[in-house]
């Protein structure tokens, strides 16, 4: 995915990433020899970011906008090395990886958490959902596990049928080579689909309206 290509444009940075970078620089100036406890530093940054006004955040948002423009500009002229696409091709017709029991639970309870805690960040909502799942009795997890198992079964049938159809250019390659790479390909797909699941969850979090609880 272009990790080794030095010509590949540097990824775009979010306003929060710029803020963290600034925090890091400030910290280095104040304590040049001190080693940084990463989790503690992250926590402090996060707390500071939460208390910052929109005006204060504006500076970093402008930096992020400028960086996004730079990235888009550079990507237009960037040619990936031979044999590599900008992003691994994903067939939109390929069956979607099924959600886990926990993912189904999250879909069910995310609005509740956001309703009860309107100011919560995506990460904190996820943390609360994890805590809630851990506080749920095994019997009560069963319907989610059953549904997830059903969806997994369906996915396995669908993916088998999808693979049986095969990709046109795959037939040209040797059968032995194809068999060898099959396991690796499945692992990659699983990893990729897990990323998708996380991305979707983040998107859902960003899209959902936050409603107050008791009126």
């Amino acid at each position: 995915m272009g990790k080794g290509d030095p010509k590949k444009p540097r990824g775009k940075m979010s306003s929060y990433a710029f803020f963290v970078q600034t925090c890091r620089e400030e910290h280095k100036k104040k304590h040049p020899d001190a080693s940084v406890n990463f989790s503690e530093f992250s926590k402090k940054c996060s707390e500071r970011w939460k208390t910052m006004s929109a005006k204060e955040k504006g500076k970093f948002e402008d930096m992020a906008k400028a960086d996004k423009a730079r990235y888009e500009r550079e990507m237009k002229t960037y040619i990936p090395p031979k044999g590599e696409t900008k992003k691994k091709f994903k067939d939109p017709n390929a069956p979607k990886r099924p959600p886990s029991a926990f993912f189904l639970f999250c879909s069910e309870y995310r609005p509740k958490i956001k309703g009860e805690h309107p100011g919560l960040s995506i990460g904190d909502v996820a943390k609360k959902l994890g805590e809630m799942w851990n506080n749920t009795a095994a019997d009560d997890k069963q319907p989610y596990e059953k549904k997830a198992a059903k969806l997994k079964e369906k996915y396995e049938k669908d993916i088998a049928a999808y693979r049986a159809k095969g990709k046109p250019d795959a037939a040209k390659k040797g059968v032995v080579k194809a068999e060898k790479s099959k396991k690796k390909k499945e692992e990659e797909e699983d990893e990729e689909d897990e990323e998708d699941e996380e991305e979707e969850e983040d998107e859902e979090d960003e899209d959902e309206e936050e409603d107050d609880d008791d009126e």
Partner: antibody, heavy 122, light 108 residues
């Protein structure tokens, strides 16, 4: 004001059916698990059924499984209990209750309706 | 299923006295899964304590909960006239939400 108001109770013959309703107000109904809990005359409390916020997941006590169906209409802020094949032992006051999750301190029924009486008798 | 046994069945006390209500589970219950409710005649139950020891909103501090594992206690430090009622403990350990049979606190 946060409120739950049950209706639909009454006298029914054994083997008959009844549909209870619970109207919710003052809170975001679609964010909560809802329960039906019953209390036979002079007896203790017994949970009957539970439904998840979207209505996609339901749970029943063994004593009512296969006879009762819990459902909800989030657009109407209403919870339902369809009771079929009623028996004399189903005679009770039926309460709807909201399940509240108190972070790591667990779960409890924090809001209850006033109850509706169901009498199964010939 | 986890059975909840409350004792005593009835507690006869005078206003101003201390009430100690016991609730025993047939097997260990997580503290976060134990709650106490108060019910007066003709009324719906009211949540008093959740997570074994946390008072619900609006509950006076004369009510306190304690305990862990299989033994839990509800204490009313000084009984007020409005405290005479039936008290139920309730656990959530499986999808069975079981209640104790109740303890009636009556005026002596």
């Amino acid at each position: 004001e946060v409120q739950l108001l049950e209706s639909g109770g009454g006298l029914v013959q054994p083997g008959g059916s009844l549909r209870l309703s619970c109207a919710a107000s003052g809170f975001t109904f679609s964010s909560y698990d809802m329960f039906w809990v019953r209390q036979a005359p002079g007896k203790g409390l017994e949970w009957v059924s539970r439904i998840s916020p979207s209505g996609g997941y339901t749970y029943y006590a063994d004593s009512v499984k296969g006879r009762f169906t819990i459902s909800r209409d989030n657009s109407k802020n209403t919870l339902y209990l369809q009771m079929n094949s009623l028996r004399a032992e189903d005679t009770a006051v039926y309460y709807c209750a909201r399940l509240r999750y108190f972070d790591s301190r667990g779960y409890a029924f924090d809001i209850w309706g006033q109850g509706t009486m169901v009498t199964v008798s010939s | 299923d986890i059975q909840m046994t409350q004792s005593p069945g009835t507690l006869s006390l005078s206003p101003g006295e201390r009430a100690t209500l016991s609730c025993r589970a047939s097997q260990s219950v997580r503290s976060s899964y134990l709650a106490w409710y108060q019910q007066k005649p003709g009324q719906a139950p009211r949540l008093l304590i959740y997570g074994a020891s946390t008072r619900a909103t609006g509950i006076p501090d004369r009510f306190s909960g304690s305990g862990s594992g299989t033994d839990f206690t509800l204490t009313i430090s000084r009984l007020e006239p409005e405290d005479f009622a039936v008290y139920y403990c309730q656990q959530y350990g499986t999808s069975r939400w079981t209640f104790g049979q109740g303890t009636k606190v009556e005026i002596k």
